[in-house]
Structure formats: structure tokens, C-alpha cells
Amino acid sequence: MRTEAQVPALQPPEPGLEGAMGHRTLVLPWVLLTLCVTAGTPEVWVQVRMEATELSSFTIRCGFLGSGSISLVTVSWGGPNGAGGTTLAVLHPERGIRQWAPARQARWETQSSISLILEGSGASSPCANTTFCCKFASFPEGSWEACGSLPPSSDPGLSAPPTPAPILRADLAGILGVSGVLLFGCVYLLHLLRRHKHRPAPRLQPSRTSPQAPRARAWAPSQASQAALHVPYATINTSCRPATLDTAHPHGGPSWWASLPTHAAHRPQGPAAWASTPIPARGSFVSVENGLYAQAGERPPHTGPGLTLFPDPRGPRAMEGPLGVR
């Protein structure tokens, strides 16, 4: 989960630590500590909605809550792209939009969110249990993917609340880049604190956050591999696979989204922030690239409330996405 920067409140230094050396040894650790605490990780949210007018028509919206620049978005269904999922659309911020039936209209809504209308396969909606996944490749974070589906009993015209899915995957490029620096900083911080442990440390005031505010945590490979063992399997019913249609796809068009209640206290991300709610929707999934799924909101045992990242087994090149897109 992405967390808002929580800058620790510092008490004045104790007498006797006021010298130049004292200042230098104090400032650096607290800057590093702030970095470690505030190191928010990106987040992808997914919203799936069945249109009231056409019961077999779906609209998927996805957004990326992160500071990096998005290099590619891939929307798939039936599971993550490349793990049995079928690509519905690929959106590149500068190179354009590609989509395949039953996708009818893919578009950028903002610089960090996209929407996709799917045309249904019949009068009724056999696709209500289909899982839709959005993968955002970004720099420097790497690739992040979240999946969602309609809640089983959703009424037409209503949508599952956007799923602020903690994404259990990131490419090595992003992890080694950002997390490596942070990890090094945190280790260095501990080293400094140990060196100066004979000195009384400034007291930290506990930051006031709401009960559901997620805590930041530094990434460690051991945590990731441990968590991987505990991700439960879930069966995904992808019985609905409309026949492939050869259609031309118009772009652009009106925005059909009414404002939802805003739960953006910890997501100061501009236009897309309203679409992120801390309450996971029933039927929405968090995906893991190796084919495992965890129900959103159910945390793997022993991993705590923080985010656990899984490096992409394909290595740094995996963030390139569809071929030729660098």
C-alpha cells in the first residue's frame, strides 16, 4: 500500500550534542529514517463495472498511484497477462492505444488512469465472474499488476469499489533501484545508531494516523519468498470467453463516471485519488505473477500489514512489456 509521508516529530537534541559533529551525526540518521519510514510503494487500483444500459457491457477502470512515469498499461482478462490471461488492450502514453475484441473503447482518462469498455456477448451477462487485470509498467518502480472482478451479487449499473490492491509483484529493475537505495540507507542508519548508542537518542513522537492507515515497510527478499509460500490458491472461473470479433474501435468519447465517495487521505495523487478506497471489494483479486492469487484484503500469514513485493522471475527486461516497447 502506498503511504503518505509521515515525518517523525523530533525533540530538541540533548545538551552536549550541539557541536558541529553532533549536528552532522544527527541530521543524516534522521533524514535516512524519514526516508525509510516514508518510502511509499506504488499501488494499482482496479474497478470493474457492469453498465445498467447494456447488461453484458463492462467498463474497467485502472489507475496507478505512484510517483514514477508510466511506460505501458496492459489490460487482460482471465488472469494476468502472460499467465493464461488474454490481452484486451495495451496503452502506451506516447505510442498509442491497441485493443482487441471484445474491447470496444480503451482510453487514457488521466496521465495515470485508463478505462476500457467491453462489449458483451449476449443479452444476459455470463461474464460477471471474469477476472480483469491491469498491469502498469513504470519507471523506476517496475511492473505492478492488480486484478478485479464484479462482486457476485452486484446490481447492474453499480460497480465494485475501486480495489486499492497491494500488488505482490515488482520487477527487479524497480526493486533493485529504489529498494536497494532505501535498504542501504536503512542499514547505514542502523550502523550509525549503533555507533552512537551511548548517546541519548531524540524521542520520536508517534504519528497520528487513522486505524486503517497502512504502515510502510522496507522490502526484503526473505520476506517476499516467505510470503510466496503462504499465498492461498483461488479458483478463477473464466467460463465467459466471447468469440473473437473483428471490429474497428473508435477512440475518445464521454466520461461516464460519477464521483464516488473520496477515501484519499493517504493517497495525495491528484485526479485519480478519489478512486482509491481502503476497503477491498468482494470479488477483486490481487495477482501474483507466478499464477497464484490472493483474495484482496486477505493477507498472507506472517507478512504483517506492509507490502510484500515479488521480483519478476524474468528479470529487468520484463518491464518492457509487449515487444519493442522499451
Partner: antibody, heavy 114, light 113 residues
């Protein structure tokens, strides 16, 4: 290094069909979304269609519907374009290219002549 | 379909000169959601497949010399070669990357005097 290797030149008779191949290498094949482009002699480029490799979803330029059929074979990392009911108008160089046209095959020259 | 119109159809310049070619689209190629123009430029040398030079109207593909510059927005776009080299002899195409079907301009043939 990404490579798209196309099949060799074809000389066919009017009314016949031909199947051109484009073998992709250098990455996972399911990352290849293939476009097909026609270039008539000394003329501009025309987009024929594209294909998504996971389940073969396609888009066609209306002009080439009924003329071209795009398929993929994931096991051999190869995309195919079949052209049918050939006429002299179909004589051209046909290129395959990746999703955003940043890698191209070397082209397949098709000559339709009796 | 979006029609792409290029001008001039050909031009002849001496090495070292600056050259500008134009591309106009029948519909806007600006994506309102992210304010990006979906237009690409390609260079095709004799006997070779096209090569991507510019995408997003102004972003150079990696490995493309910085003498190639793309500009423009909406329906009017320009490709500029700041100092033409002998190896730039080619046909240059613009392409609608905005919506299906993807359409190309008729090309501008660059000849070196």
C-alpha cells in the same frame, strides 16, 4: 536483439492463395503483438491488421477484410498472414512489425502473375 | 479513417542544410486524457523496411540522431532535419498512431544534391 524473420518471395497465379510467415525471436512470443503492412511498388504503406498472440484476437483494416486472415502459432513463435483470391493488385511487399512498429521484418515480396 | 497528407512529395537539398517536411491529419491525433499526440515518423531507405524515427509526435526513438526533431500537435505536424547528411536519403512517412485503422501519409522523398 529482437528479430522478425519473414518467409521468402512468392510468385503465385491469380485466384490462388498464399500464406506468409513472420517468425519472432528475442523475447517471449506472447509479448509479440504483430502488425502487417502492405507496400505496393513505389507507393506508400497500408496497415492491414494486427493480432494479439495469446488468443489470436485481431483487428483488420476494413479494406483488407475478406482478403487477409491473420493467425498465430505460439508453439513456433510465428505469425501468419493468408491472402486469398489474389489479383495483380495484391502484388506488393508485405511487412510484419511489432506492436508499435518499432521492429520490422525484412519484407516478403508477393508477385501475382499468370 | 484518418487521412494523413504529407508535403512536399519530394525535396532536394544539399548536405548540411536544414530541411522541414509537413504532415497534416484529417482528425486530431491529440489524446485528451493524457495530452499526448499519437503521431509517428518513419524513414525508409531504398530496399529496406521502414524505421521508426519519432513517436508521440516529438519523442526520438533510441538510437536516432538528434538532428531529427518532431513537433506539432492536433492535426499539424513537422519533421525537421537540422543538418542533412548523405545517409538521410530516404522516403519519410508520418503515421496516425491514434486510432484504427492506422494510416500512413503518402511520404516525402528526400534527395541529396
Amino acid at each position: 536483439e529482437v528479430q522478425l524473420q519473414q518467409s521468402g518471395p512468392e510468385l503465385v497465379k491469380p485466384g490462388a492463395s498464399v500464406k506468409i510467415s513472420c517468425k519472432a525471436s528475442g523475447n517471449t512470443f506472447t509479448d509479440y503483438y504483430i502488425n502487417w503492412v502492405k507496400q505496393s511498388h513505389g507507393k506508400s504503406l497500408e496497415w492491414i491488421g494486427d493480432i494479439e498472440p495469446n488468443n489470436g484476437g485481431t483487428n483488420y483494416n476494413q479494406k483488407f477484410k475478406g482478403k487477409a486472415t491473420l493467425t498465430v502459432d505460439k508453439s513456433s513463435s510465428t505469425a501468419y498472414m493468408e491472402l486469398r483470391s489474389l489479383t495483380s493488385e495484391d502484388s506488393a511487399i508485405y511487412y510484419c512489425a511489432t506492436l508499435y512498429f518499432d521492429y520490422w521484418g525484412q519484407g516478403t515480396t508477393l508477385t501475382v502473375s499468370s | 479513417d484518418i487521412v494523413m497528407t504529407q508535403s512536399p512529395s519530394s525535396l532536394s537539398v544539399s548536405a548540411g542544410e536544414k530541411v522541414t517536411m509537413s504532415c497534416k491529419s484529417s482528425q486530431s491525433l491529440l489524446n485528451s486524457g493524457n495530452q499526448k499526440n499519437y503521431l509517428a515518423w518513419y524513414q525508409q531507405k531504398p530496399g529496406q523496411p521502414p524505421k521508426l524515427l519519432i513517436y508521440g509526435a516529438s519523442t526520438r526513438e533510441s538510437g536516432v540522431p538528434d538532428r531529427f526533431t518532431g513537433s506539432g500537435s492536433g492535426t499539424d505536424f513537422t519533421l525537421t532535419i537540422s543538418s542533412v547528411q548523405a545517409e538521410d536519403l530516404a522516403v519519410y512517412y508520418c503515421q496516425n498512431d491514434h486510432s484504427y485503422p492506422f494510416t500512413f501519409g503518402s511520404g516525402t522523398k528526400l534527395e541529396i544534391k
